[in-house]
Amino acid sequence: LPAQVAFTPYAPEPGGTCRLREYYDQTAQMCCSKCPPGQHAKVFCTKTSDTVCDSCEDSTYTQLWNWVPECLSCGSRCSSDQVETQACTREQNRICTCRPGWYCALSKQEGCRLCAQLRKCRPGFGVARPGTETSDVVCKPCAPGTFSNTTSSTDICRPHQICHVVAIPGNASMDAVCTSTSPTRSMAPGAVHLPQPVSTRSQHTQPTPAPSTAPGTSFLLPVGPSPPAEGSTGD
């Protein structure tokens, strides 16, 4: 004959254990029902009556099957440098993570206790290792032939642009400035366009500056009718 299904509460077999989602109550010496997530034990079981469960109150939660007398309090509201990635419900705690541009300097079991702003690499330095959720940006000096002209937590050192004729050589914090070998229609004859107009982003009706120049910015330097002489400042 099949063994009878025991209904809680029941006395376990000697040396036996309670079933899944049950617990052994020391006072009653019985296997009793646990409460589901989102609830807690309002009344503990006795030899003749099972656990009585009740819903968690606002701002409290239980995440697991349990027999706790009171639900756990949700964590405090997220600070200004954090975003709430999981709201406080009856079944889960609030989780705060660092907002974009910040990283977790001190973590807790879930989410972050203390956020810190990602380091910004200053001009002449680029990002060697990007920031992650739990680690800061690592900066490095731009190597010869590369530059960064921004203060940024994301920009890497970029190569200097190739010039036919260099007007101003690049350095760690500035791109090379090129002279134009063939002025386009929108430029005055005998002008030097800084930087090189068409080695970069295309726009044929007017010269376009290199990416390191602010959009819509172009520089015209008047020079004599002959091409610029090669001097100490550049080619």
Epitope: G145, H160, I162, C163, H164, V166, P169, A176, G234, D235
Partner: antibody
Framework: EVQLLESGGGLVQPGGSLRLSCAAS????????MHWVRQAPGKGLEWVSA????????YYADSVKGRFTISRDNSKNTLYLQMNSLRAEDTAVYYC?????????????WGQGTLVTVSS | QSVLTQPPSASGTPGQRVTISCTGS?????????VHWYQQLPGTAPKLLIY???QRPSGVPDRFSGSKSGTSASLAISGLRSEDEADYYC???????????FGGGTKLTVLG
Amino acid sequence: EVQLLESGGGLVQPGGSLRLSCAASGFTFSSYAMHWVRQAPGKGLEWVSAISGGATTTYYADSVKGRFTISRDNSKNTLYLQMNSLRAEDTAVYYCAKGGTGDPYYFDYWGQGTLVTVSS
Amino acid sequence: QSVLTQPPSASGTPGQRVTISCTGSSSNIGAGYDVHWYQQLPGTAPKLLIYRNNQRPSGVPDRFSGSKSGTSASLAISGLRSEDEADYYCAARDDGLSGPVFGGGTKLTVLG
């Protein structure tokens, strides 16, 4: 008429050196950036190095940085590529190319190429 | 692996129109940099076919045209001829690299 003529290729052992030359004519050599581009047998094109018109600034692909040196002699209208510490993967046809008018990032004229074979 | 992506091969019959694509990223084509195309006939040096996205050097037939949109570009060849059988390469400047970058090349076969 623009002409670019490479020379100096040949067979060299790994670790060895070679110097390529490119004789240019038909344009104002010193006004243009010049490039070296290579093509391994049966493979695609790979940019290797460039030099500005006045030879003040040089540019290299990461794969050759520290081993190759680009230079030019504007009085002789000649471009050079000194290749040291050569490796088997440097085996390729090496082309010299002229930077495009107004834009050094394209090549409006190419030489016929010179073959460099690195093998023991 | 090339920075710019091209189909390894393409084919068409004489008179047909074929297009070859070239896909890049936000650091090259998508950054607004011009795309250039080169033709390499068997056993010869590459030759400039299209520059600055859609400009043809003198001597290049108007059967060849180029276009660019977003992070990709394409080369179109109309009225295909047997002498168009060649390798075609796209190229562009890239923010993170010192020199221009190339596509892996597309081998165009003219059938029949």
